[in-house]
């Protein structure tokens, strides 16, 4: 019985009631592997989803998210609202990153600025809500005898930036 069904190719299902005949999947359904007993209903890309790849009798539809949203989960199972750079999505919607944190993408959470002093470096460019700080040479490298293409950064607490 199993051997007969294994002859049924993708795009068909094995109909046990019909002497293991391979019936094409009905409209709006598919089987992506051979030997299937049933065809699966095609995924509908509706609402916040849009179709990236149409369904066929041998493969399911693939969805993307409409503009203003991005995919989450395996095979884009969910769409999450985009925020602006410098923001993160909370239960109450998009909120600006707190001081000392940044987000350079339309998705994800705000992350703390890099602490340059942990690497023995100084702040070359201050951080913002949208950008991390840029660390520069360590203060020792900026002694009067050392040649430097850039002037020393103002002496202030690492990561500090007036908002």
């Amino acid at each position: 019985l199993q051997d007969l069904c294994s002859n049924c190719p993708a795009g068909t299902f094995c109909d046990n009631n019909r002497s293991q005949i391979c019936s094409p999947c009905p409209p709006n359904s598919f089987s992506s592997a051979g030997g299937q007993r049933t065809c699966d209903i095609c995924r509908q890309c509706k609402g916040v989803f849009k179709t990236r790849k149409e369904c066929s009798s041998t493969s399911n539809a693939e969805c993307d998210c409409i503009s203003g949203y991005h995919c989450l989960g395996a095979e884009c199972s969910m769409c999450e609202q985009d925020c602006k750079q410098g923001q993160e999505l909370t239960k109450k919607g998009c909120k600006d990153c707190c001081f000392g944190t940044f987000n350079d993408q339309k998705r994800g959470i705000c992350r703390p600025w890099t602490n340059c002093s942990l690497d023995g470096k100084s702040v070359l460019v201050n951080g913002t809500k949208e950008r991390d700080v840029v660390c520069g040479p360590s203060p020792a490298d900026l002694s009067p005898g050392a040649s430097s293409a850039t002037p020393p950064a103002p002496a202030r607490e690492p990561g500090h930036s007036p908002q």
């Epitope: 002859n7 049924c8 190719p9 993708a10 795009g11 068909t12 109909d15 009631n17 019909r18 005949i21 391979c22 019936s23 094409p24 999947c25 009905p26 409209p27 709006n28 359904s29 149409e54 066929s56 009798s57 041998t58 493969s59």
Partner: antibody
Amino acid sequence: DVQLVESGGDLVQPGGSRKLSCAASGFTFSSFGMHWVRQAPERGLEWVAYISSGSSTIYYADTVKGRFIISRDNPKNTLFLQMTSLRSEDTAMYYCARDWVDYWGQGTSVTVSS
Amino acid sequence: QIVLTQSPAIMSASPGEKVTITCSASSSVNYIHWFQQKPGTSPKLWIYSTSNLASGVPARFSGRGSGTSYSLTISRMEAEDAATYYCLQGSSYPWTFGGGTKLEIK
């Protein structure tokens, strides 16, 4: 836009042969099985043959078995129906349709007459 | 092979009238499809897998049934519904069509 365009129909003598083609566009042809269906003048629809997406499974109506051969060329997005030993009762409009039967061509007319 | 018998073969209905076309199978089938065909055109898939309306089909159409008995219903007939309707069983080879029902507008 999905399109199926049949060609090759003509007037053929009884006992003669004819090869019909169906050019597909607007969808992934190699992902779909395909059918041929025909309709005699002022008559109903008759299913003729089916071929799976990779040509591994083929079925025919009893009325054409042994005389017609369905085949496909996936790289060229084309379906074929080779008809031999044609009879007057094969006179019909021949349609190709994808396996979901949701899209059909406009048909090509085959007339078998002396 | 499975024989599909459609009834009536021909009928006429007034605008607004409810119309039911039946399709009876000689042995049990898993589902049927319905097609609409107008003169000089290719058949159009109208209802698939017994009860699902194809894209663009008005909501006044519905399909139901199981086993050997299936039907297509138009809740309120409109002039544009005048056509020939065919049922098709795709459960068993050879696939078979019903003989068609010609629906005319009064």
